[in-house]
């Protein structure tokens, strides 16, 4: 999906009002210096591309974050403020339902959410280019 045509300011507002708090809740009890950020993003479409991929792609040691509150709110924000996003996600959602597993917060998931926080912070930088 090409995130170029999203309403970035609306997504930023959704992040600041709720998603950021959910990320903090998920990371509660973890020191902010515990994990090194190894990925970043260039402009706002790039940030959303990486946020979407990191939030919804299973990775080694962290099978799924998709059912977490911050992930569901991220998905909702993208669906509302990125034209055509919902249609591109139908097949992915159906596949995810088949794979659904018990939620387990591993250290790898905490590290992944720490990376997500960094990507969201970068997305919100005032000087970051729209595209």
């Amino acid at each position: 999906y090409d995130f170029t045509n999203c309403d970035f300011e609306k997504i930023k507002a959704a992040y600041l009002s709720t998603i950021s708090k959910d990320l903090i809740t998920y990371m509660s009890g973890t020191k902010s210096t515990e994990f090194n950020n190894t990925v970043s993003c260039s402009n706002r479409p790039h940030c959303l591309t990486e946020i979407q991929s990191l939030t919804f792609n299973p990775t080694a040691g962290c099978a799924s974050l998709a059912k977490e509150m911050f992930a569901m709110k991220t998905k909702a924000a993208l669906a509302i403020w990125c034209p055509g996003y919902s249609e591109t996600q139908i097949n992915a959602t159906q596949a995810m339902k088949k794979r659904r597993k018990r939620k387990v917060t591993t250290n790898k998931c905490l590290e992944q959410v720490s990376q997500l926080q960094g990507l969201w912070r970068r997305f919100n930088r005032p000087l970051l280019k729209q595209q």
Epitope: T38, V39, S42, E50, L127
Partner: antibody, heavy 117, light 108 residues
Framework: QVQLQESGPGLVKPSETLSLTCTVS?????????WSWIRQPPGKGLEWIGY???????SYNPSLKSRVTISVDTSKNQFSLKLSSVTAADTAVYYC??????????WGQGTLVTVSS | EIVLTQSPATLSLSPGERATLSCRAS??????LAWYQQKPGQAPRLLIY???SRATGIPARFSGSGSGTDFTLTISSLEPEDFAVYYC??????????FGQGTKVEIK
């Protein structure tokens, strides 16, 4: 300390597919960062080809996108480049590099690929 | 596509002298700029990122400055091992990251 090493054929015929592999040691490619390819034609400047992140997102240089595939084999701690329909203009030293998806902090030593019949 | 123009193409200096290399972007890249050093037959090495932050292990004689469209890499006092080609790279314009054409710093 992370080390990267490119490998693959040094000579490829025009219209064929160039295939290179980068073997990473000292760091698990599924643990973090992005893994990138960059090339440098003889005596010229650098050109970014693309990257694959540790969580699977892929990004390519638009000028090469139609011909490029980057993939990863976590079991071997390797990532690969395929460039199809090559011409003499694809003759270059090809580097693999670790990236934070912005800039490139560790590089392989490079491998020269010549496109010639 | 953002074009990076480096100047001069070649800089002839003696060890101990100060080197000032320029990189100009065709449009603003904020501070999203890196500098690399490349010696003959070797891979590039990251020197500076975010326009002015030194990469790990880079000596303090290397410094970067600038924002927007005009950037400078300064080597305060050239050591023999500093004679090489230097490239700038912008990462403001994903997915079109681009490099400058390079500045060669040679021994006078």
């Amino acid at each position: 300390q992370v080390q990267l090493q490119e490998s693959g054929p040094g000579l490829v015929k025009p219209s064929e597919t160039l295939s290179l592999t980068c073997t990473v040691s000292g760091y698990s490619i599924s643990s973090g960062y992005g893994w990138s390819w960059i090339r440098q034609p003889p005596g010229k400047g650098l050109e970014w080809i693309g990257y694959i992140s540790y969580y699977g997102s892929i990004s390519y240089n638009p000028s090469l996108k139609s011909r490029v595939t980057i993939s990863v084999d976590t079991s071997k701690n390797q990532f690969s480049l395929k460039l199809s329909s090559v011409t003499a203009a694809d003759t270059a030293v090809y580097y693999c590099a670790r990236t934070n998806l912005l800039y490139f902090d560790s590089w392989g030593q490079g491998t020269l690929v010549t496109v010639s019949s | 596509e953002i074009v990076l123009t480096q100047s001069p193409a070649t800089l002839s200096l003696s060890p101990g002298e100060r080197a000032t290399l320029s990189c100009r972007a065709s449009q603003s890249v904020s501070n999203n700029l890196a500098w690399y050093q490349q010696k003959p037959g070797q891979a590039p090495r990251l020197l500076i990122y975010d326009a002015s932050s030194r990469a790990t292990g880079i000596p303090a004689r290397f410094s970067g400055s600038g924002s927007g469209t005009d950037f400078t890499l300064t080597i305060s006092s050239l050591e023999p091992e500093d004679f090489a080609v230097y490239y700038c790279q912008q990462y403001s314009d994903w997915p079109q990251y681009t490099f400058g054409q390079g500045t060669k710093v040679e021994i006078k």
